[in-house]
Every structure is written in C-alpha cells, then in structure tokens.
C-alpha cells in the first residue's frame, strides 16, 4: 500500500475552517489522482468529499462540497469549511493513483479535527 | 508513586474555559491533599495554580488564580479560565497527600488543552 502522511491533530478556526496537508509517497508519476476525505466518528465512516485531479492542475470538488484544495507535487493542501462542534472527529485522507496503471491506494492514519462552536455575538441594538 | 488519571484531550470553550477531572488512586483517606496544575509547552514546565484542601472541603485557590475546583472522594474537578490560543499546551495534574504521613506523590500524564481564540464580533454601530 502507498504511504500517506497527514497531521495527527488540527484545530478548526473559530469560523469553522480546518486545513491540513495530505502527502503521499508516489511510486512514480501519476497523471490522474483521486483524493477522498473520510470522517470516522463512533466507528462510523462517512465520505466528506472527493476530487479527481490531473497532476499540475487544481483540485476540483463538487460545487456544494465543503472542501477545497490545491496540489503541489505529492502534497495536497485540503481545507474543510462550515465545521461545527458536532463535526469533531477523525478525518482520513485517502489517495488513489488512477492513471497510468498500475492503480495504487494509500490511506492515512487520520487527522483529529477539533471544532469549538463560537459564542454568539451580542445583539447590536 | 501514586497513580493519577486525567483525560488525554480537552477543548476549551470559546470563552476560554476548560474543565477536566483529575482522579488519584489514594491508598486510603488523606485528610490534607495538595493539587497542583502544571503546564508543559516547548519542554518548559510552569505552575498554573495550586490548592491545598481538607478532605470533604472545597478547594481554595488564591484569589487571583485562573483555576477553580471541587473535590469528591478521590476526584478533583478542575476548571481553568481565561485561556487564550497561546495557552494551548499539556496541563499536568500533580497530587500530593500531605497528611497524615507518609507523604504520597502522584503525577498524571497530562491533559492536552486546545484553545482557539474567538473571532471578534463586528462593531455595533
């Protein structure tokens, strides 16, 4: 399996934005890479977002995705937004080298993202 | 050495308040117990606060202390307030059985407290 590295812990900002780098040890020069972010909480794993990109190009997530990202070599800079305290959990980076063959798969150990809901601002009367 | 248990991770609230329980495996019923909270960051250890209490009574920290606490049996419920993002670090609970003799000492593995500074509220014009 391909090695994937990601930070152990990240704190979301008070605006609910968390960013981390997912780095994969590519055995060669893939031209098409797929990155998926999975969330594990209470032994449940759900897909947060996914993007396929051509090396040297931007990552393109779906329009309604909470993720954005950029790539540089074997590193993917991922940003997840709109996070609330209830979204605290382990976010796992999964990388697939889609083309050219052979297919490679790597899964990181996960980044624990902690999210704290902000206090509401006082009403401006 | 006396065993001391404390949670691995705690998130401070958006108001900068963090609470955790420090539990010590007492060999019996000490009548006088001293609890100290130490902060370890960048291999520096500093004392955050300390209180000596008689079993069954409240913990009394100094008036200007950022800590408050209550005790119940072999558990101490600690609250640290006024925390900022720069205060993120490992907070270690140290428990000493002061009386009756013999003296017992226990030091926990530490609680990693994460603190996120809130976004400032917009000015109310």
């Amino acid at each position: 399996a391909m090695h994937v590295a990601q930070p152990a812990v990240v704190l979301a900002s008070s605006r609910g934005i968390a960013s981390f780098v997912c780095e994969y040890a590519s055995p060669g020069k893939a031209t098409e890479v797929r990155v998926t972010v999975l969330r594990q909480a209470d032994s449940q794993v759900t897909e947060v977002c996914a993007a396929t990109y051509m090396m040297g190009n931007e990552l393109t997530f779906l329009d309604d995705s909470i993720c954005t990202g950029t790539s540089s070599g074997n590193q993917v800079n991922l940003t997840i937004q709109g996070l609330r305290a209830m979204d605290t959990g382990l976010y796992i980076c999964k990388v697939e080298l889609m083309y050219p063959p052979p297919y490679y798969l790597g899964i990181g150990n996960g980044t624990q993202i902690y999210v704290i809901d902000p206090e509401p601002c006082p009403d401006s009367d | 050495a006396m065993h001391v248990a404390q949670p691995a991770v705690v998130l401070a609230s958006s108001r900068g308040i963090a609470s955790f329980v420090c539990e010590y495996a007492s060999p019996g019923k000490a009548t006088e117990v001293r609890v100290t909270v130490l902060r370890q960051a960048d291999s520096q250890v500093t004392e955050v606060c300390a209180a000596t209490y008689m079993m069954g009574n409240e913990l009394t920290f100094l008036d200007d202390s950022i800590c408050t606490g209550t005790s119940s049996g072999n558990q101490v419920n600690l609250t640290i307030q006024g925390l900022r993002a720069m205060d993120t670090g490992l907070y270690i609970c140290k428990v000493e059985l002061m009386y009756p003799p013999p003296y017992y000492l226990g030091i926990g593995n530490g609680t990693q407290i994460y603190v996120i500074d809130p976004e400032p509220c917009p000015d109310s014009d």
Partner: antibody
Amino acid sequence: QVQLQESGPGLVKPSQTLSLTCAVSGYSISSGYYWNWIRQFPGKGLEWMGYIGYDGSNYYNPSLKNRVTMSVDTSKNQFSLKLSSVTAVDTAVYYCARNYYSGYFDSWGQGTTVTVSS
Amino acid sequence: DIVMTQSPDSLAVSLGERATINCKASQNVGTYVAWYQQKPGQPPKPLIYSTSYRYSGVPDRFSGSGSGTDFTLTISSLQAEDVAVYFCHQYDTYPLTFGAGTKLELK
C-alpha cells in the same frame, strides 16, 4: 521493603488475656502509616480488630467492646495487641498489617495461630 | 457496620476462562474497595485497591470495577496459580470490614 512478623503464645486459657507482638522491619513505625490487627476465624472470615497510629492514636472495632488494647514500642519498632477475657470464639489466626489512614492493607505479617482452650 | 456481601461462595472455572466475583456493600462506599487473594497457609495479598487499580506486580488479567455499592473482581483468563480464596474489603468507613470470601477452584 517493609516486613511484619507476629509472635506470642499459641495457646491461651479461657478468661485469660491474649498478648501478641508484631515486629516491623524496613520501616520506622513512628514515621507514618497505621498499624493494625486483623484476625481470621477457622471458618475463614476476616475481622479487623483495630489500629494504633504512627502518632499513638488508636481506634478499636466496637464489636470487641472494651476487651482490646493496642500499644506501640518505638524503641523496638514493634506494636502489640492485648485481648482480655478470651473465650473459644477468639480462636483464630492473628495477623498484623499496615495501612494508610482508612486504607487498604498493603503489607501483612505471616500470621500466628492462637487457640483458646483449657 | 458496613456489611460486604460476596457472591458466589465458591466458583469453579476452567483454565483460560473468565472468573467473576461480586461484592455488594450495605451502604455507599464510593470507590474505597480493595480485593485480596489468599492461598492456604498464607496471609491475604492485595490485588486491587481503590476499586480498579492493580497493586504493584499484580498481572493485568486481574481487574476491578464498580462504585457505590456494587463491585466486581474479574480474572480475564484463569491460570492454575489463581486458585485461591478472594476477599473484598471496604475502607470507606471504620470499622473496616471484609466480605466472607469466594473460593475459586479449577473446573
């Protein structure tokens, strides 16, 4: 490593006073802890009899009424038990043991068997 | 006095199987409960104190749980050397008291 060792007569006549001594090595009894006597009846049940503290304080099991007295000899690093007006029901293995105040017993002697019989 | 009621009186368990001994206090004793193991001709030996903490040198197959009035000693995988009598003990309130003991045998 603290060690406790009981000594005393193995046979006591009814109505007499049972006297036992516990010699402590590896720890000074005046430095701390509480020094207890516990007995185990032939049916294997354990009964805590009381303690004498490092400071000379004591507390006895109310079930023994006024029959029990404990004392300490710091110069010999030993403590003693006296149980008066014994009857056959006081036949038991007598252990000395150490604990923290109102604590569990972390060190025990090997025990000495006392039989009350005429 | 606080009465510690131990159950069962005796228990036969196969090697490698789990053994569970229960102790019920007649009133709340918090977490101030210890467990001892006694083999023939020997004094009781501390296994667990403060409900769930293993005494120094005690194998991790021994564990304790509970609080208040109900407590349990568990041996996760019985070994031949675990055959003994086990006692619970409350040290919350004087006079300190013990359970009557559970004799653990090999099946």
